[in-house]
């Protein structure tokens, strides 16, 4: 890995368990400032792997607030708008990273936590099972 | 939004902002574990809008290793395996949350960053751009 | 051995419901997608319903959509049929299919069958 | 829906003969048939994928041809355990598994 050089001014840590448990500033820096939701606000509708989005709410998790892409069909979309089985919508998903309330209902003790969302639909050609 | 009791075992809070800075516990919890990578892993390469994947490393964040999607082509490959240019192969994107090292190369103190990353691509039809 | 063997069928009247099984041994269940298929008496066949892997993925015929409910236990290697508002016309022997696809996708065809359960609806 | 017609309904052949099936689809399903055989009180048997790919364990005399709208499933020489009903399967357009009527083939 790469070694980072200790900043001077770093906080000091209490915690004999350090650096398991660590100070999060929670005043969001967004850094996508040159990018615009509109372009691919609609791609849900106009994939050839069409999806539906679904709101997924926890109060005990921050965000509280996660969208999931469910696809619409099983086949895809055919250039004559009708849908092809002989291949396969299926869900792009990728592992994002939570903030999980612990102790439960604590507003300011939070435990990292992985989370599998489905992002969005790609169609896929479906491959034979070769048994050994 | 939902109003939730506070649990009386939690940790007190010193800092006069809280709760802007918070305390969070590194051992990530897994939820993904009904979940075989297996499964999704070539998508990049089956989908009609395949994707290569490219590393983003960034010791100053945590995780420091994000993967990032490129569309291969500009269309999306057809029934003959040929690149259909009628059809745009669009990267779906995702805002994510990371951690972002503050003050800088500090082991123990974090500010939450939202970054946005493409997972994958998705072949959508083009739409018109009617000018008023 | 590598088989499915279906059970559940038998004497049912119109309107009333049964649930099918079909349990997996020999493979990887969650590997493989899996169907309900059926064939009236001297009859052709027919196709009832589909899942995928992971029960992210459901179709059914059209002819039983809203009716029958397919559903999976990966962890007891099982397949299930939840038939409510059974007609004279869903009388037919139902067969457990695995579909070919690899990574428990559909490829809609049937690589594996087991030998049926019979379901008469009939007052 | 997309409707397959196999013909004939029934083949006469002694052992030995040729049998030369016949799927026709009602609309295009590209190379997208199977072919399946079933015999007396079992399960049917997967012999042909994507018209003309052989599924693992299945002789070479049988054989499959065909693209859009007419396929063709031959048995090169019919063997004694060959005399059973064959049905073709669809799998492009919904509901992907639309089989048909079925070919029983019979001992002359």
């Known amino acids: 890995g790469i070694t980072i050089p200790r900043n001077p001014g770093c906080p000091n840590s209490e915690d004999k368990n350090f650096p398991r448990t660590v100070m999060v500033n929670l005043n969001i820096h967004n850094r996508n400032t040159n990018t615009n939701p509109k372009r691919s606000s609609d791609y849900y509708n106009r994939s050839t792997s069409p999806w539906n989005l679904h709101r997924n709410e926890d109060p005990e998790r921050y965000p509280s607030v996660i969208w999931e892409a469910k696809c619409r069909h099983l086949g895809c979309i055919n250039a004559d708008g009708n849908v092809d089985y002989h291949m396969n919508s299926v869900p792009i998903q990728q592992e994002i990273l939570v903030l999980r309330r612990e102790p439960p209902h604590c507003p300011n003790s939070f435990r990292l936590e992985k989370i599998l969302v489905s992002v969005g639909c790609t169609c896929v050609t479906p491959i034979v099972h070769h048994v050994a | 939004g939902i109003t939730i009791p506070r649990n009386p075992g939690c940790p007190n809070s010193e800092d006069k902002n809280f709760p802007r800075t918070v305390m969070v516990n590194l051992n990530i919890h897994n939820r993904n574990t009904n979940t075989n990578p297996k499964r999704s892993s070539d998508y990049y390469n089956r989908s009609t809008s395949p994707w290569n994947l490219h590393r983003n490393e960034d010791p100053e964040r945590y995780p420091s290793v994000i993967w990032e999607a490129k569309c291969r082509h500009l269309g999306c490959i057809n029934a003959d395996g040929n690149v259909d240019y009628h059809m745009n192969s669009v990267p779906i994107q995702q805002e994510i949350l990371v951690l972002r090292r503050e003050p800088p190369h500090c082991p123990n103190s974090f500010r939450l960053e939202k970054i946005l990353v493409s997972v994958g691509c998705t072949c959508v039809t083009p739409i018109v751009h009617h000018v008023a | 051995e590598v088989q499915l063997v279906e059970s559940g069928g038998g004497l049912v009247q119109p309107g009333r419901s049964l649930r099918l099984s079909c349990a997996a041994s020999?493979?990887?269940?969650?590997?493989?997608?899996m169907h309900w298929v059926r064939q009236a008496p001297g009859k052709g066949l027919e196709w009832v319903s589909g899942?995928?892997?992971?029960?992210?993925?459901?179709g059914y015929a059209d002819s039983v959509k809203g009716r029958f409910t397919i559903s999976r236990d990966n962890a007891k290697n099982s397949l299930y049929l939840q038939m409510n508002s059974l007609r004279a016309e869903d009388t037919a022997l139902y067969y457990c299919?695995?579909?070919?696809?690899?990574?428990?996708?559909?490829?809609?065809?049937?690589?594996?069958w087991g030998r049926g359960t019979l379901v008469t609806v009939s007052s | 829906e997309i409707v397959l017609t196999q013909s004939p309904a029934t083949l006469s052949l002694s052992p030995g003969e040729r049998a030369t099936l016949s799927c026709r689809a009602s609309?295009?399903?590209?190379?997208?048939l199977a072919w399946y055989q079933q015999k007396p009180g079992q399960a049917p048997r997967l012999l042909i994928y994507?018209?003309?790919n052989r599924a693992t364990g299945i002789p070479a005399r049988f054989s499959g041809s065909g693209s859009g709208t007419d396929f063709t499933l031959t048995i090169s020489s019919l063997e004694p355990e060959d005399f059973a009903v064959y049905y073709c399967?669809?799998?492009?357009?919904?509901?992907?598994?639309?089989f048909g009527g079925g070919t029983k083939v019979e001992i002359k």
């Open positions: 609309q295009s399903v590209r190379s997208y």
């Open positions: 299919a695995r579909d070919m696809g690899g990574f428990g996708e559909f490829y809609w065809n049937f690589g594996l």
């Open positions: 994507d018209a003309s």
């Open positions: 899942i995928n892997w992971n029960s992210g993925g459901i």
């Open positions: 020999g493979f990887t269940f969650d590997d493989y997608a």
């Open positions: 399967q669809q799998r492009s357009n919904w509901p992907p598994a639309t």
